[in-house]
């Protein structure tokens, strides 16, 4: 066969679907690889072909579109399963071609099982809610295109294993789940089960997402440098190890980049001709506020190093701060035999 632009196996789109539920999978060519859509391709006389490789097999084979009740079908650039079976797991390829053009991409599809409490190996999307912020909503995800707008599905929401009804601050509102006010206790997995009819059959769509309650922007403050501070003096003798921690608290801020860095005499440590190492550790609170610690270390400090200015800097979307460490050279204790004896008039 003639050459085909092969985009390979698109592992970025690790598609997971539940067993015994409908699944609609769009050919990724039009979403991520080509600059035109399916309608344009179809109008230009290009044909979309689907095939697959079963799990643990090397052989590519055509997809059987003649199964009972059209269990697998194709509609425009969408591959439909009504419903999926466990052994549909494999790598699927969609190929767009005519006599002069060919482009294809493969993607993995995994059909997973769930238990009665919706536990499964499915990777769950995370939705962040602000703590004590006011009404916030989550929406049942990825259900568009499964049924026409004329069909009115029934939607049931669960937290973990429990159906959500008569919860204090969580109210199901169709496709939305409203949190009147979110608390840490609202952390957990929430599942919507969408039930709809189609051609005399009833289908279920199960969608689970993880809710994580995070710090509210209303309480967010600029970075706070806890260390270095005015109460601690780093007093060292030449040859000793100098260790200065820079500990910074960052309020949680959605999509904010938190940065901590040291300067020595106004320059980045890399630009100073001394042997400095910097080690960073990060910890998070329950609401994802962040504490970053960068420890500046000079193994064998010199008297020159002890005269330098060591400044810790921090930046977030709320502002930038800096604090200087107080570094001094330790004055050696007087040696009794010489200094003190002389002081007492000894001869």
């Amino acid at each position: 066969s003639e050459r085909c632009d092969d985009w390979g196996l698109d592992t970025m789109r690790q598609i997971q679907v539940f067993e015994d539920e409908p699944a609609r999978i769009k050919c990724p060519l039009f979403e991520h690889f080509l600059k035109f859509n399916y309608s344009t391709a179809h109008s230009a006389g290009l044909t979309l072909i689907w095939y697959w490789t079963r799990q643990d097999r090397d052989l590519e084979e055509p997809i059987n579109f003649r199964l009972p009740e059209n269990r697998i079908s194709k509609e425009k650039d969408v591959l439909w399963f009504r419903p999926t079976l466990l052994n549909d797991t494999g790598n699927y390829t969609c190929m767009l071609r005519n006599t002069t053009y060919c482009s294809k991409v493969a993607f993995p599809l995994e059909v997973v099982q769930k238990d009665s409490c919706f536990n499964s190996p499915m990777k769950l999307p995370v939705h962040k809610l602000y703590i004590e912020y006011g009404i916030q909503r989550i929406t049942c995800p990825n259900v568009d295109g499964y049924f026409p707008s004329s069909v009115k599905p029934t939607i049931t929401w669960y937290m973990g294993c429990y159906k959500i009804q008569n919860f204090n601050n969580v109210i199901p509102e169709g496709m939305n789940l409203s949190f009147l006010i979110a608390f840490i206790s609202n952390n957990g997995n929430y599942t919507c089960v969408v039930t709809y009819p189609e051609n005399g059959r009833t289908f279920h769509l199960t969608r689970t997402l993880t809710v994580k309650v995070v710090g509210s922007p209303k309480n967010a403050v600029p970075p706070v440098i806890h260390s270095p501070n005015d109460h601690v003096v780093y007093e060292k003798e030449p040859g000793e190890e100098l260790l200065i921690p820079c500990t910074v608290y960052f309020s949680f801020l959605m999509d904010s980049r938190n940065e901590v860095w040291w300067t020595i005499d106004g320059k980045k440590p890399d630009d100073i001709p001394i042997d400095v190492t910097i080690n960073e550790s990060i910890s998070h609170s329950r609401t994802e506020d962040e504490t970053r610690t960068q420890i500046l270390s000079i193994k064998k400090v010199t008297s020159e190093d002890l005269k330098r200015s060591y400044v810790c800097h921090a930046r977030s979307a709320k502002g930038e701060v800096a604090k200087a460490a107080t570094v001094k050279q330790k004055v050696p204790a007087p040696r009794y035999t010489v200094e003190l004896a002389c002081g007492f008039g000894a001869t």
């Epitope: 912020y133 922007p217 209303k218 506020d289 709320k318």
Partner: antibody, heavy 118, light 112 residues
Framework: EVQLVQSGAEVKKPGESLKISCKGS????????IGWVRQMPGKGLEWMGI????????RYSPSFQGQVTISADKSVNTAYLQWISLKASDTAIYYC???????????WGQGTTVTVSS | DIVMTQSPLSLPVTPGEPASISCRSS???????????LDWYLQKPGQSPQLLIY???NRASGVPDRFSGSGSGTDFTLKISRVEAEDVGLYYC?????????FGQGTRVEIK
Amino acid sequence: EVQLVQSGAEVKKPGESLKISCKGSGYSFTSYWIGWVRQMPGKGLEWMGIIWPGDSDTRYSPSFQGQVTISADKSVNTAYLQWISLKASDTAIYYCARSSGGTAMDVWGQGTTVTVSS
Amino acid sequence: DIVMTQSPLSLPVTPGEPASISCRSSQSLLHSNGYNTLDWYLQKPGQSPQLLIYLGSNRASGVPDRFSGSGSGTDFTLKISRVEAEDVGLYYCMQGLQTQWTFGQGTRVEIK
């Protein structure tokens, strides 16, 4: 440049209504509180209340609760301070300022002088 | 309400000399996240107030390093290491621990 621009000076009679404004620019208006502060002639600063323009969550000082209304229109990046019925004792300079959560009123408006006199 | 008490209320200073203003709150301003919700503001004659220090000890952007804030809990201090003529005005502390924020009465700093 981050700035808050307040509406101009007002001279009113007792019993009249008034709404003064504070327009933010150069930053995300819905990501900071806007606070209002009163300064009566020759006196210190008094905190009146704050609003979060993102959802209009408003908190008042007990001294000003029921006396004034704080509101915001995020579509025009503007906060407002309103009186239904002014009194002579409302004569003051009113400042708006942006703030992070519970701290740092780091940008202030130029102040609006309100004079209430019969 | 948290009550903020400043002292002194008037502070005559000599340029080049240090100066110190105290602020005491009626309850601790130490937040559970380890910072103190106390700010210092300066209002120069005829101007809007300006932020000097926030969260107890953090200098605001553009504030000269002769200004420093210290303290924790209920007792706080604003220090000016060497007073300059442009530092005259009214200094206020403000607490932001609760959503009812409150200012101190103000300290008037003037040149002797």
